[in-house]
């Protein structure tokens, strides 16, 4: 079906980790030969249309806004392109999660939060009273779903050897395998500072 064409992209213009009732803009890569672009959500192996954009001449990539994010809107999204009456192309998939459905977990560190490049740190996400199956560690400002994920309880996330790019604000979330797109309220934040200057003064607050 795809022939020699690369798979078109789908992307979120902001974080795909979206607070309950928040919003996100989704962009589908424009395809020259498509006269219609549809945004679909995939639920239980069935596709449901969320929105559609007709092709206009020299138009930029079609965008769709998901408003009032909730449990029904969390999940896997795909762009569907109509090439002809019976011809379709599909983009890659995008996963959106909604946060704020359960009580929060707790994020802690095994050492101070100011690091030198090359050092190691482990962040632990725990929830003594809510039996989450899994935890995800998110860095503020990232435009993709958190790569750090654990099925342990508590969950240990090893960061390191660190470089300057590791600096940032981290939070963790708890969730259940049965509902992988429905996440907890965010944990407390931890700000990691990676600096190659030992003369800087940094303070952290709890």
């Amino acid at each position: 079906q795809e022939g020699d064409f690369p798979m078109p992209f789908i992307s979120a213009k902001s974080s795909p980790v979206i607070p309950l009732d928040g919003s996100v803009k989704i962009q589908c890569q424009a395809i020259r030969e498509a006269y219609l672009t549809q945004l679909m959500i995939i639920k239980n192996s069935t596709y449901r249309e969320i929105g559609r954009r007709l092709k206009f001449w020299n138009e930029t990539d079609p965008e769709f806004v998901i408003d009032h994010m909730d449990a029904n809107k969390a999940g896997r999204y795909q762009c569907q392109y109509r090439i002809g009456h019976y011809r379709f192309r599909y983009s890659d998939t995008l996963e959106l999660v909604v946060t704020g459905l359960y009580g929060k977990p707790f994020l802690s560190a095994d050492r101070g939060l100011v690091l030198m490049p090359g050092e190691n740190i482990s962040l632990t996400c725990s929830s003594a009273h809510i039996p989450f199956d899994r935890f995800s560690l998110a860095k503020e400002g990232e435009l993709s779903l958190p790569q750090h994920q654990s099925g342990e309880h508590p969950a240990n996330f090893s960061l390191g050897p660190v470089d300057l790019n590791v600096s940032g604000i981290y939070r963790c979330y708890g969730w259940y395998n049965r509902s992988p797109y429905l996440w907890s309220f965010p944990s407390n934040a931890l700000e990691l500072v990676v600096t190659d200057s030992i003369h800087q003064d940094y303070t952290t607050q709890n």
Partner: antibody, heavy 119, light 107 residues
Framework: QVQLVESGGGVVQPGRSLRLSCAAS????????LHWVRQAPGKGLDWVAV????????YFADSVKGRFTISRDNSKNTLYLQMNSLRAEDTAVYYC????????????WGQGTLVTVSS | AIQLTQSPSSLSASVGDRVTITCRAS??????LAWYQQKPGKAPKLLIY???SLEGGVPSRFSGSGSGTDFTLTISSLQPEDFATYYC?????????FGPGTKVDIK
């Protein structure tokens, strides 16, 4: 010591608006999740709304959804509850509540401010 | 929403009595339950969190137990300052909910 002091309550007519404030002191305000909880005269406790430490995550009870908004100003150590389209059943003492740092129980409560909705 | 029911709704007891209050959740909440004490005209005060952990500064005569759907608050020897209304609260999932309360008064 931790202090939460609510203000802005009073008597208001049905359909009108009111904004409650909660001034916090004695802790690092920007690190804590905060809630509003209310209690109608002679009745039990009723959870109203929550806001995350950075203000991004919010959640409301169904009874106030679409009418109340919660916000915070971390530079002023203040929590707000904007109440629109008030109804008689919104009459209550409104408490500003701090959530525990490591879990979602309520470890500190303000003294409350009374909102009376009456014509 | 998860519903919490408390029993009894009120009870009369004497100083020195052992008092037990129960809280039942409409679905499992693991140990995500807290207990609060409220006296007339005052704000509630946290006693127990995580079903069984005693909040700092709370007398050891208060204890909590249970997990899943059934929880208990016990006052081992009732003191004059314990006459109040007690509420359970679940923090497992939003919206957070409270039980209707149990009023403990003097026999």
């Amino acid at each position: 010591q931790v202090q939460l002091v609510e203000s802005g309550g009073g008597v208001v007519q049905p359909g009108r608006s009111l904004r409650l404030s909660c001034a916090a002191s004695g802790f690092t305000f920007s690190s804590y999740v905060l809630h509003w909880v209310r209690q109608a005269p002679g009745k039990g406790l009723d959870w109203v709304a929550v806001i995350s430490d950075d203000g991004r995550n919010k959640y409301f009870a169904d009874s106030v959804k679409g009418r109340f908004t919660i916000s915070r100003d971390n530079s002023k150590n203040t929590l707000y509850l904007q109440m629109n389209s008030l109804r008689a059943e919104d009459t209550a003492v409104y408490y500003c509540v701090r959530e525990g740092y490591s879990g979602s129980w309520f470890d500190y409560w303000g003294q409350g401010t009374l909102v009376t909705v009456s014509s | 929403a998860i519903q919490l029911t408390q029993s009894p709704s009120s009870l009369s007891a004497s100083v020195g009595d052992r008092v037990t209050i129960t809280c039942r959740a409409s679905q499992g909440i693991s140990s995500a339950l807290a207990w609060y004490q409220q006296k007339p005209g005052k704000a509630p005060k946290l006693l127990i969190y995580g079903a069984s952990s005693l909040e700092g500064g709370v007398p050891s005569r208060f204890s909590g137990s249970g997990s899943g759907t059934d929880f208990t608050l016990t006052i081992s020897s009732l003191q004059p300052e314990d006459f109040a209304t007690y509420y359970c609260q679940q923090f497992n999932s939003y919206p957070f909910t409270f039980g209707p309360g149990t009023k403990v008064d003097i026999k």
